[in-house]
Amino acid sequence: HEGGQDKPLLSAWPSAVVPRGGHVTLLCRSRLGFTIFSLYKEDGVPVPELYNKIFWKSILMGPVTPAHAGTYRCRGSHPRSPIEWSAPSNPLVIVVTGNSSSSSSSPTEPSSKTGIRRHLHILIGTSVAIILFIILFFFLLHCCCSNKKNAAVMDQEPAGDRTVNREDSDDQDPQEVTYAQLDHCVFTQTKITSPSQRPKTPPTDTTMYMELPNAKPRSLSPAHKHHSQALRGSSRETTALSQNRVASSHVPAAGI
């Protein structure tokens, strides 16, 4: 275990076993006073909550789906530029159980009814939006056809000039289009739940994160090659380690 005492400690609160639809807080702690962290999933499947983001202390994930299950690691750093990441933390396995969460299972989890209701709303909303889109599409198509006929008869200015040629946008860098918001740092705050919703539980913690610019990974020194595992799925900005002192050890960590 390289850099055992310097690497962060990743844990899940209240538990690494999470019911489907429930919530889990991933915490990255350290002996080196790291103030920012990057989390990634080892199987490379991107998790939206983690993708390309930097976190302050913790991140609340949920409602949890089977896609969230897997092995996670975090890296720590200090907010200097360029960001240099520590060795990866201990692996943390998140297990998603089949049943929806019940109201008593965790203070940060919604009830299963709320979860089901939310999913129904999403499903219905999406269906309605698709149907409306199809109707609108056919309506526009119809209008377009009638306009063309009218234009031919009345010799009006062609409507074609006013339509957007989709092929024109192909010249743009698709990466730039997709990640336009990442060209500058975006700070976001996400509240877990309001205190009134869950009395007699820990105070609401604010998950702070910052979206990362699409920086190319900096090359690692030969001594650190074994740490060059990219922050697959969560972050593509793998850089050199923040600790020059890297050696091997096993630090037993008591589970929570």
Epitope: G3, D6, L9, F34, V251
Partner: antibody, heavy 117, light 107 residues
């Protein structure tokens, strides 16, 4: 069994230097980081910092940067705390402690340092 | 830095009584809290970690509870050997800080 045995009491004058030792036994020394904690007479516990027992890299709490130095003699499974340019306010009992998951499961018996002119 | 507020600062109780010592933190530390007992002239001894996990060998009359910012350690049926100072410490990350301590005395 696991033990952390510290050096004996010290009586020093202001401006002098002291070096306190902490000998570990009963476990693999380089598997656990070593921390130092100060306790002034009749006061509470104050974390001073820690040393990486694999690499010798020290980390100091803000109040203990400058005159304080952590070091190791890995072959002797011993950690050291050195305090330079001693002041009266350094009068305290100093503990070494082993860290597992950021809490301290084993402690040395403490070394009492008295700084007096 | 995370501030730790321990209460009461001192407590007098009789053998056989039940006492509770509390620790409040300035920010959410989830369950990362440890409790130590220190007797006069001795080093601290770990009693509880992760807020409620009792260290092997610690009598079951001790119990830890809480999460977030509010924590407590309860001692049922006090024994003569339980008297001394008690400290809480967060193990959320550096800098580690301890509570001011609670002096538990025999009434």
């Amino acid at each position: 069994q696991i033990q952390l045995v510290q050096s004996g009491p010290e009586l020093k004058k202001p401006g002098e230097t002291v070096k306190i030792s902490c000998k570990a036994s009963g476990y693999t020394f380089t598997d656990y980081s070593m921390h130092w904690v100060k306790q002034a007479p009749g006061k509470g516990l104050k974390w001073m910092g820690w040393i990486n027992t694999e690499t010798g890299g020290p980390t100091y709490a803000d109040d203990f940067k400058g005159r304080f130095a952590f070091s190791l003699e890995t072959s002797a499974t011993t950690a050291y705390l050195q305090i330079n340019n001693l002041k009266n306010e350094d009068t305290a009992t100093y503990f070494c402690s082993r860290d597992v998951d950021l809490y301290f499961d084993y402690w040395g018996q403490g070394t009492t340092l008295t700084v007096s002119s | 830095d995370i501030q730790m507020t321990q209460s009461p600062a001192s407590l007098s109780a009789s053998v056989g009584e039940t006492v509770t010592i509390t620790c409040r933190t300035s920010e959410n530390i989830y369950s990362y809290l440890a409790w130590y007992q220190q007797k006069q002239g001795k080093s601290p001894q770990l009693l509880v970690y992760n807020a409620k996990t009792l260290v092997e060998g610690v009598p079951s009359r001790f119990s830890g509870s809480g999460s977030g910012t509010q924590f407590s350690v309860k001692i049922n049926s006090l024994q003569p050997e339980d008297f001394g100072n008690y400290y809480c410490q967060h193990h959320y990350g550096i800098p580690f800080t301890f509570g001011g301590g609670t002096k538990l005395e025999i009434k």
